[in-house]
């Protein structure tokens, strides 16, 4: 029985050239988080394995930094970074939980963070 919920930063925006932290948090379960995958559409950005540590995809090594925590920091943002990002929590023994974040990269300096929301 999967009882957990993923809380994410929801819809967020950031300035071109700036950086942003993608964060998810798994709650309402005692399951052990064994691995978190960060993906953009079907492209793997990074993995944080509870035992093996971090793996950053070679194509993103220059612009992605691990953390804070299980989160991911995107740097040197471009308008092409606009889109959906997914945090995929692999847990034991529950299984897999997925959270969604939509990032909009703006040309101007009027970037505002959206409200947090939950995905069951």
């Amino acid at each position: 029985m999967m009882t957990g919920t993923i809380e994410t930063t929801g819809n967020i925006s950031a300035e071109k050239g700036g950086s942003i932290i993608l964060q998810c948090h798994l709650s309402s379960t005692t399951a052990q988080v064994t691995q978190v995958n960060w993906e953009q559409q079907d492209q793997l950005l990074a993995i944080c394995n509870a035992d093996l540590g971090w793996h950053i995809s070679p194509s993103f090594k220059d612009r992605v930094a691990p953390g804070p925590g299980l989160g991911l920091t995107l740097q040197s943002l471009t308008v092409n970074d606009t889109g959906e990002y997914f945090c995929i929590y692999h847990t034991y023994p529950d299984g897999t939980y997925t959270g969604r974040i939509f990032l909009e990269v703006l040309e101007s300096s009027v970037a505002e963070h959206g409200a947090r929301f939950q995905i069951p």
Epitope: D51, L52, H90, P93, G95
Partner: antibody, heavy 124, light 107 residues
Framework: QVQLQESGPGLVKPSETLSLTCAVS?????????WAWIRQPPGKGLEWIGS???????YYNPSLKSRVTISVDTSKNQFSLKLSSVTAADTAVYYC?????????????????WGQGTMVTVSS | EIVMTQSPATLSVSPGERATLSCRAS??????LAWYQQKPGQAPRLLIY???TRATGIPARFSGSGSGTEFTLTISSLQSEDFAVYYC?????????FGGGTKVEIK
């Protein structure tokens, strides 16, 4: 190059405990990777038994969890499997394997290297 | 747990022909899928990981594709040494699970 070698009794009596050891050569067991046990009953498919990380994190197949213990001995560079209360259904070839050797380069976890396997028969 | 289903159970192919093996996951595993080859009396050998990356020393005639729940292993031109049983396996979710296998036999 990393090599794995299983050892242990080939015959175990019903209700007893099956004990196997996997000796690792060419790599320090405490440097990383998962260390896994997988079995294959005669003429059947592969079944993952469980995996351990050198720090002590263990993950077991739910169907076997109540009977399985996997441990690591870093001083001997080996890891072990204990399966209690065995029955004829536990008769199988038991393999040890390395899991995660490609993780740091590619981010994927698979059973990269396998031992040759050891046949264990449960019979009185 | 994620259930892996392979089809067909047996595939009869002539040497030199193409073989296409399928593997389906009961829920999405993204591209976290591996393929193994096992010959009689031998341990399985890793062929493909990450759904499409060939392991070290694996010939180019072996290729993997797919993402999510549907995966394919293709052997472009079967050699005599390719007749064996092939298994797919998912990770990282625990428990690790294997498909039931596809036996590729000589037609």
């Amino acid at each position: 190059q990393v090599q794995l070698q299983e050892s242990g009794p080939g015959l175990v009596k019903p209700s007893e405990t099956l004990s196997l050891t996997c000796a690792v050569s060419g790599y320090s067991i405490s440097s990383g990777y998962y260390w896994a046990w997988i079995r294959q009953p005669p003429g059947k498919g592969l079944e993952w038994i469980g995996s351990i990380y050198h720090s002590g994190s263990t993950y077991y197949n739910p169907s076997l969890k109540s009977r399985v213990t996997i441990s690591v001995d870093t001083s001997k560079n080996q890891f072990s499997l204990k399966l209690s209360s065995v029955t004829a259904a536990d008769t199988a070839v038991y393999y040890c394997a390395i899991e995660g050797a490609n993780y740091y380069d590619f981010g994927y976890v698979a059973f990269d290297i396998w031992g040759q396997g050891t046949m264990v028969t449960v019979s009185s | 747990e994620i259930v892996m289903t392979q089809s067909p159970a047996t595939l009869s192919v002539s040497p030199g022909e193409r073989a296409t093996l399928s593997c389906r996951a009961s829920q999405s595993v993204s591209s976290n899928l591996a393929w193994y080859q096992q010959k009689p009396g031998q341990a399985p050998r890793l062929l493909i990981y990450g759904a499409s990356t060939r392991a070290t020393g694996i010939p180019a005639r072996f290729s993997g594709s797919g993402s999510g729940t549907e995966f394919t292993l293709t052997i472009s031109s079967l050699q005599s040494e390719d007749f064996a049983v092939y298994y797919c396996q998912q990770s990282p979710p625990w428990p690790r699970t294997f498909g039931g296998g596809t036996k590729v036999e000589i037609k």
